[in-house]
Amino acid sequence: QPDSVSIPITCCFNVINRKIPIQRLESYTRITNIQCPKEAVIFKTKRGKEVCADPKERWVRDSMKHLDQIFQNLKP
């Protein structure tokens, strides 16, 4: 079996320029692969849509923190 995990590269080339209400968000993924032009966050909405956002923006970081807390509190 392979000794390392190979993950398909997903990149964000454009980011959303408006805030997504936190109640519409379901989860997020960090994009840090250096083969991508910029670090980014992909938010998944409750309708299943994936949206790229800029983690330098305050609302993005706040949304990530909020989702982290929700998921942590769901754990037994």
Epitope: R30, T32, I34, P37, K38, E39, P55, K56, K65, D68, Q69, F71, Q72
Partner: antibody, heavy 117, light 107 residues
Framework: QVQLVQSGAEVKKPGSSVKVSCKAS????????MHWVRQAPGQGLEWIGR????????KFDPKFQGRATITADTSTSTAYMELSSLRSEDTAVYYC??????????WGQGTTVTVSS | DIQMTQSPSSLSASVGDRVTITCKAT??????LAWYQQKPGKAPKLLIS???SLETGVPSRFSGSGSGKDYTLTISSLQPEDFATYYC?????????FGGGTKVEIK
């Protein structure tokens, strides 16, 4: 291929200042944060602070606030960290690293700063 | 500031051993934990972020687990190149803080 290349070793007198540079290639520093972390001989890692090169905004560990200055020149893709009022306890290897999210996936090779009278 | 307590500070192990390093935060850090490996004279290397996410190219014998305040790095079968010092780091809240390190030595 991302590379962070730092300036060479420095020997400084107590009370003086040191300025360390970190030149990035393979990435646009405007798209990330540039952090500075230090490691005293035989000790652990200590975060100093970071800059958003896109706008110059900085954040520091309160321990270094007022004594450390972090700047960036986006035209040369270079970040700088200056530490003033040096004392012997500042003898350490100083690293630059990149990362928006607060963890550090690419690091410079380190710059040794020795403070000695 | 959030303090990170890492244990043990050092351990001796043999090639093939299963090694576990723990990291405890003074408050809930919501999985915002990274693990690094550092070899003498070298910069740290990121192994894991988000408590469990293995960086690209990091061998699958490394794994991370935990939640809340308590986190673990496991090396399932220690290899010769794994003898190094390991650090945890929280990135929930600035100032970002590191554990004191765990030196993994050859028995």
């Amino acid at each position: 291929q991302v590379q962070l290349v730092q300036s060479g070793a420095e020997v400084k007198k107590p009370g003086s200042s040191v300025k360390v540079s970190c030149k990035a290639s393979g990435l646009n520093i405007k798209d990330t944060y540039m952090h500075w972390v230090r490691q005293a001989p035989g000790q652990g890692l200590e975060w100093i602070g970071r800059i958003d090169p896109a706008n110059g905004n900085t954040k520091f560990d309160p321990k270094f606030q007022g004594r450390a200055t972090i700047t960036a020149d986006t035209s040369t893709s270079t970040a700088y960290m200056e530490l003033s009022s040096l004392r012997s306890e500042d003898t350490a290897v100083y690293y630059c690293a990149r990362g928006v999210f607060g963890f550090f996936d690419y690091w410079g090779q380190g710059t040794t700063v020795t403070v000695s009278s | 500031d959030i303090q990170m307590t890492q244990s043990p500070s050092s351990l001796s192990a043999s090639v093939g051993d299963r090694v576990t390093i723990t990291c405890k935060a003074t408050e809930d850090i919501y999985n915002r934990l990274a693990w690094y490996q550092q070899k003498p004279g070298k910069a740290p290397k990121l192994l894991i972020s988000g408590a469990t996410s293995l960086e690209t190219g990091v061998p699958s014998r490394f794994s991370g687990s935990g939640s809340g305040k308590d986190y673990t790095l496991t090396i399932s079968s220690l290899q010769p190149e794994d003898f190094a010092t390991y650090y945890c780091q929280q990135f929930w809240s600035a100032p970002y803080t590191f554990g004191g390190g765990t030196k993994v030595e050859i028995k």
